[in-house]
């Protein structure tokens, strides 16, 4: 190899200034004896290399970009040979941000996977390789001391969330839990969380039925429509408030809204919808009166109110 | 402290009736599901029935279903279990207990002892 | 309903002895299986609940593990207080069924 090129820093904030040396052999004895040393920066050649000879013979070349404003490029130093350019040396130069602080970090049990999600905003394009890392510890009070540390977790690439596994997760006691993002550039923190998981735990919806008539009820009213649910079982035991949401199915109607439905209801008569007409329904339950997230809408049921009787 | 005391057990003939009683302090009662569980000699535990915080939700074993009433006084802090039609196989020690969100018995009273026989 | 088989039945033990019991599911329960230990004449004590969360005031040396169908109860340690039964109870759903318990014995 007849050149080398070192550089100031290989990555740097975009925009800033970058100086880089490349420095050709004395054997390189096909070459001029004062051989001129051009700089390129992709294909672009770039003026304003100083050029010296050293002391050990050497040539050596110094540049100076202003700024560098491509995300990604290649310098290189070259000599003219011939009619052509001979490239002695490049390096990749990378241009970026230090990440950004990851922001609205949010989390939620799922207690089917029996694993804590937390998902979070990564902020602006770096323009750099960033890794993010979700780091939590135990914490027997509200997060000021911290306890036992949980094994981080890294989500795949690109991913802006990431799974802690139950056997990390100790219930009904708090966990501080933040984010960290760092490329070559800096590194960043997210403000820290200071959750029990068990506050945070999303449910499964019931699942929304008709209610089977029995032969002493009386058959409902026209406009209304006899509901019931049956809950999601492994979530039983955990007191929680629910709603319903209907509508039309033709039309352009939006949903409405009706709710809390009577606390440990899991029957429900459903009054002033027009008669005649199909209905969509959907219900949703939260943890309540406990923190918790509300469940996503169950699957819909399809329903259609009686005639009203002829006068 | 959390604490539950059951009573209301005893002797009684076969296709009798008994009412157990638990009462609990220590704890908002009315937050939380209670449910009883039974142990026949030597035997294991064998749930029997729970019920919901406010006492609408009360799903039973099948072995005591249409002959248990599970019930509950949230103003006295009490739990019931009416037991009728009592047959041999429900001579066991029943424990009164709070039921967890994620369905664990945590703490448990001392027990009652009911033994059917003629 | 969802059967729940613990094995084994019996075991003796040596203080200082690691113990291993394991109840398995007759269907996926995820993480709803709970442990207890009961003494002769006493009601049972929670140990472990969701699998592997410890209640509190329980020794370490007791620790859960497993999920879906497969669960495991390790003591790390026998101590003498630690001679009982030990039942494992599924949660997921109604009817609430419990193992037919392990009677640990000392050897």
């Known amino acids: 190899e007849c050149g080398h090129i070192s550089v100031s820093a290989p990555i740097v904030h975009l925009g800033d200034p970058i100086t880089a040396s490349c420095i050709i052999k004395q054997n390189c004895s096909h070459l001029d004896p004062e051989p001129q040393i051009l700089w390129r920066l992709g294909a672009e050649l770039q003026p304003g290399g100083r050029q010296q000879r050293l002391s050990d013979g050497t040539q050596e070349s110094i540049i100076t970009l202003p700024h560098l404003n491509h995300t990604q490029a290649f310098l290189s130093c070259a000599l003219n040979w011939g009619n052509s350019l001979q490239i002695l040396d490049q390096v990749e130069l990378r241009a970026g941000y230090p990440p950004a602080i990851p922001h609205n970090l949010s989390c939620l049990m799922n207690l089917t996977t029996s694993s804590l999600i937390c998902q979070w905003e990564p902020g602006p394009e770096t323009h750099l390789p960033t890794s993010f890392t979700l780091k939590s510890f135990k914490s027997r009070g509200n997060c000021q001391t911290q306890g036992d540390s949980i094994l981080d977790c890294v989500p795949k690439d690109g991913q802006s969330h990431c799974s802690i596994p139950r056997k990390h997760l100790l219930l009904y006691q708090n966990m501080g839990i933040w984010v960290q993002a760092e490329n070559a550039l800096g590194t960043s923190m997210s403000p820290q969380l200071c959750l029990d998981p068990m506050d945070v735990v999303k449910l499964e919806p019931p699942m929304l039925r008709t209610m089977d008539p029995s032969p002493e009820a009386a058959p409902p009213q026209a406009g209304c429509l006899q509901l019931s649910w049956e809950p999601w079982q492994p979530g039983l035991h955990i007191n929680q408030k629910c709603e319903l949401r209907h509508k039309p199915q033709r039309g352009e109607a939006s949903w409405a809204l009706v709710g809390p439905l009577p606390l440990e209801a899991l029957q429900y008569e459903l009054c002033g919808l027009l008669p005649a007409t199909a209905y969509t329904l959907q219900i949703r339950c939260i943890r309540w009166p406990l923190p918790g997230h509300w469940s996503d809408w169950s699957p819909s049921l399809e329903l259609r109110t009686t005639e009203r009787a002829p006068t | 402290e959390v604490q539950l005391l059951e009573s209301g057990g005893g002797l009684v003939q076969p296709g009798g009736s008994l009412r157990l009683s638990c009462a609990a302090s220590?704890?908002?009662?009315?937050?939380?599901?209670m449910g009883w569980v039974r142990q026949a000699p030597g035997k294991g535990l064998e749930w029997v029935s729970s019920?919901?915080?406010?006492?609408?939700?009360?799903p039973y074993a099948d072995s005591v279903k249409g002959r248990f009433t599970i019930s509950r006084d949230n103003s006295k802090n009490t739990l019931y279990l009416q037991m009728n039609s009592l047959r041999a196989e429900d001579t066991a020690v029943y424990y009164c207990?709070?039921?967890?969100?994620?369905?664990?018995?945590?703490?448990w009273g001392q027990g009652t002892l009911v033994t059917v026989s003629s | 309903d969802i059967q729940m088989t613990q094995s084994p039945s019996a075991l003796s033990a040596s203080v200082g002895d690691r113990v291993t019991i394991t109840c398995r599911a007759s269907?996926?329960?995820?993480?709803?299986l709970n442990w207890y230990q009961q003494k002769p004449g006493k009601a049972p004590k929670l140990l472990i609940y969701?699998?592997?969360n410890l209640q509190n005031g329980i020794p370490s040396r007791f620790s859960g593990s497993g999920s879906g169908t497969d669960f495991t109860l390790t003591i790390s340690s026998l101590q003498p207080e630690d001679f009982a039964t030990y039942h494992c109870?599924?949660?997921?759903?109604?009817?609430?069924?419990f193992g037919g318990g392990t009677n640990v014995e000392i050897r």
């Open positions: 207990a709070m039921l967890g969100e994620l369905g664990w018995f945590d703490p």
């Open positions: 220590g704890f908002t009662f009315s937050l939380y599901w």
């Open positions: 019920i919901s915080s406010s006492g609408g939700v009360t």
């Open positions: 269907q996926g329960i995820s993480s709803y």
């Open positions: 969701y699998a592997s």
């Open positions: 109870q599924q949660s997921y759903s109604t009817p609430l069924t």
